[in-house]
Interface confidence: low
């Protein structure tokens, strides 16, 4: 399908002008190639009428032009002094007329209505309010005032000053007679319907002395605003319906093939399941305006959308609406990234978030989509640090790999972490994307102690076990803070091929803190990565306590807590289960015994990639 998009139908009246906007993917080639507007003939050929290269056909001379806006990926065709002969089928496109990079546009120019002299024309959108002004002479001030609608040769009474109201206008019309001295009465019609369209007659008095005034009411369906967005990107519909419906329920719906409108989301809590996790209806402002954001755009999201207000939260005739025609461009600049990321309880996920690479300095955010009410997305973390304290020790946003992608790591997963998350920046809003985290059955691949207590001034060694499938990955330990995870200096142990054979004895990367200081308290992550792409992580909390006096029940020397599946021969350490710790204080009894060996010349913190045997433990 062609990526060029424009209005399918354009209608106007003789003598008027039209402006037709066509959209195209703003690639370098497209921005500079020829743009054209051509008319389809009976033979199927499309004859150029105006192009971006300056050509204007004789029929369009002096009344048409084509302007390219390469920075927006749009071009606009303006045609003035329309005649009935301009009605027909056209194409707006790029390149050569016959190439198919085009969009079909139907233009209909109709004859303007023949109106009686002195007719006042009122042009109002459906659902809105019109006030028809009816002047009268002093002698008719005390006499009956009325508004009629002309239908063919007959006039049907709509409302009069004797309290008559035509049933078709019940509860939405009023006739106002001003105070003395004002020689004008008004008729106000609310919630206009398409059927209200037509010629009306104001009348004051009767007989040959009566005052009459014609009013032509044109009730228009709102012209849909064209919206051109990239596949996988995001769209925002801003809906401003006016103060008169500020306190009425709002909705966004999508027109279906039967020309009815299916609710996408409304303020009464209804939401189409196809938009689960990727839609927000932002709380409305005092003036009743609101906006709906949809992320993770799919080709099937294309179509005509209406927003409106009605107490039922769905489309009803005679209530104000706004319209959009959404086109989803498959030649997207937004890269593919997983829309579902799976993790196991106790394990971790690393989520890749795309952003506009031209905006590398923009602030990056990650939020959790909540479906309650109209949907909202509390920020969890941003590129300058953690936002939500309950994610302390298990959530980090990294600028890597960069160049249009950042990474979010969440570990110590529980079933409560399942859900939809949004990647955001404070820059280009069209790059908002959605990812779903699913928690599946399984065991974490990286195994670390549940939590450890280190003794001040002594040496601490924390093991992290990994399976053979990670043998070619880079292993690291880092210290978590609410502004990131600072990688700890690594101490090479032996040749870099240490893990090539991946036998039972070469699956351990350990962290050494020597000597332990108060500042060492906190969360530590063990992780694997390939270049700038992060894999799994496991977290452990290190508490620091004073050295125990003689008689302490802690035995030394020993190493840190064993990994969950590891039996330890040292007397001071017991086998522990793998826990996803969120509050280390809950596990204060689970101590790790520090090595009291000679610390002279030892490094403050180091990471060892070595075998279990070298650590003095044994593997199962």
């Amino acid at each position: 399908k062609s990526p060029v998009f424009g209005p399918q139908e354009v209608s106007s009246v003789e003598g008027n002008s039209v402006s037709i906007k066509c959209y195209y993917p703003p690639t370098s080639v497209n921005r500079h190639t020829r743009k054209y507007w051509c008319r389809k003939g009976a033979s199927g050929r499309c004859i150029t009428l105006v192009s971006s290269e300056g050509y204007v056909s004789s029929n369009y001379a002096g009344r048409a032009n084509l302007t390219n806006f390469p920075e927006n990926g749009t071009f606009v065709v303006n045609i003035a002094q329309l005649s009935r002969d301009d009605s027909g089928h056209y194409k707006c496109g790029l390149g050569i007329n016959s190439r198919g990079l085009s969009f079909d546009v139907s233009l209909e120019v109709s004859q303007g209505p023949e109106l009686p002299n002195g007719t006042e024309v009122y042009t109002v959108d459906v659902g809105r309010t019109v006030t028809i002004k009816c002047p009268f002479k002093t002698e008719n001030a005390p006499k009956t005032k009325a508004l009629y609608k002309k239908i063919g040769q007959t006039s049907v009474l709509v409302i009069d000053s004797r309290n008559y109201v035509n049933p078709n206008y019940k509860d939405r019309i009023r006739l106002r007679i001003p105070g003395t001295g004002q020689l004008i009465f008004t008729v106000v019609i609310d919630r206009l319907r398409l059927s209200d369209h037509g010629l009306y007659l104001c009348q004051a008095g009767d007989g040959s002395n009566r005052d009459e005034k014609n009013a032509d009411l044109q009730v228009l369906e709102p012209e849909p605003e064209l919206v051109y967005e990239d596949l996988r990107g995001s769209v925002t519909f801003h809906c401003a319906l006016g103060l008169e419906v500020a306190n009425v329920a709002k909705f966004l719906c999508r027109v279906n093939s039967r020309e009815t409108c299916d609710v996408v989301i409304n303020t009464l809590g209804k939401r189409d399941s196809a938009f689960e996790g990727r839609i927000l209806l932002n709380p409305q402002d005092k003036d009743g305006s609101f906006s709906v954001v949809i992320t993770g755009l799919r080709k099937e999201d294309e179509g005509r959308y209406l927003c409106g207000a009605h107490s039922d939260g769905q489309l009803q005739e005679g209530w104000p609406i706004q319209a959009w025609q959404l086109f989803v461009n498959e030649e997207s600049t937004i890269p593919r990234s997983p829309t579902v990321v799976k993790g196991v309880a106790g394990g971790s996920v690393a989520v890749l978030c795309p952003y506009n690479p031209k905006e590398s300095q923009s602030l990056k955010y990650w939020c959790l989509w909540e479906g309650a009410q109209n949907g909202r997305c509390p920020l969890l973390v941003e590129s300058q640090g953690l936002v939500q304290e309950q994610y302390e020790g298990r959530l980090s946003l990294l600028q890597e790999p960069g160049n249009g992608t950042f990474t979010v790591i969440l570990n110590q997963l529980t079933t409560q972490d399942a859900g939809f998350y949004w990647c955001l920046t404070n820059g280009d809003t069209r790059w908002r994307t959605t990812v779903e985290i699913k928690i599946i059955e399984g065991e974490p691949n990286l195994k670390v102690p549940g939590n450890v207590t280190a003794v001040l001034g002594e040496t601490l060694n924390i093991p992290c076990h990994f399976p053979c499938k990670f043998s070619s990955y880079e292993k690291y330990w880092c210290k978590w803070s609410n502004t990131g995870c600072q990688t700890l200096p690594s101490q090479d142990e032996g040749p870099s091929e240490a893990f090539v054979n991946c036998d039972e004895n070469s699956r351990l990367v350990s962290l050494t803190l020597n000597p332990v200081t108060r500042a060492d308290e906190g969360w530590y992550w063990c992780g694997v990565k390939q270049g700038h792409f992060y894999g799994e992580t496991a977290a452990v909390y290190v508490a620091v306590e004073e050295k125990k006096v003689a008689g302490s029940r802690y035995v030394s020397p020993a190493k840190a807590d064993a990994a969950p599946d590891e039996k330890v021969l040292d007397s001071g350490v017991r086998e522990i289960e793998n826990k996803a710790i969120q509050d280390p204080r809950l596990f204060a009894e689970e101590k790790v015994v520090a090595d009291t060996g000679d610390q002279a010349g030892g490094s403050r913190a180091s990471v060892d990639s070595s075998s279990s045997e070298e650590q003095g433990g044994s593997s199962k």
Epitope: S291, R376, C377, P378, G385
Partner: nanobody
């Protein structure tokens, strides 16, 4: 969580001006939508103004449009409310609020962080 402290309130004559400040501590507020609300004696707390993260988008209650201006200085972690042409009906306790919600519009329910308030009295 962010802590917010308002200042700049006081007694002023009708037609006069005041500038309220809201200083944030505990974390940077450059990711927060910030707002001002007010509560007159015996009335509900009402929206006055809001400003987005970057300061590029602002909204005002109809009753203060054209008279009040909200602004922010992310470097100073501070939000301001410049109040001109004050009227007696502007008398209220003014509260500064912050929202970490990703939301284009915000009602008072969407603000998670609140200051203690500063009293503005406009005499006729």
């Amino acid at each position: 969580e962010v802590q917010l402290v308002e200042s700049g309130g006081g007694l002023v004559q009708a037609g006069g001006s005041l500038r309220l400040s809201c200083a944030a501590s505990g974390r940077t507020i450059n990711t927060y939508v910030m707002g001002w609300f007010r509560q007159a004696p015996g009335k509900e707390r009402e929206f006055v103004a809001r400003i987005d993260w970057s300061g590029s988008s602002t909204d005002y209650a109809d009753s203060v449009k054209g008279r009040f201006t909200i602004s922010r200085d992310n470097a100073k972690n501070t939000v301001y409310l410049q109040m001109n042409s004050l009227k007696p009906e502007d008398t209220a306790v003014y509260y500064c609020a912050g929202s970490a919600y990703y939301s284009g519009y915000v009602t008072h329910r969407d603000f998670g962080s609140w200051g203690q308030g500063t009293l503005v009295t406009v005499s006729s």
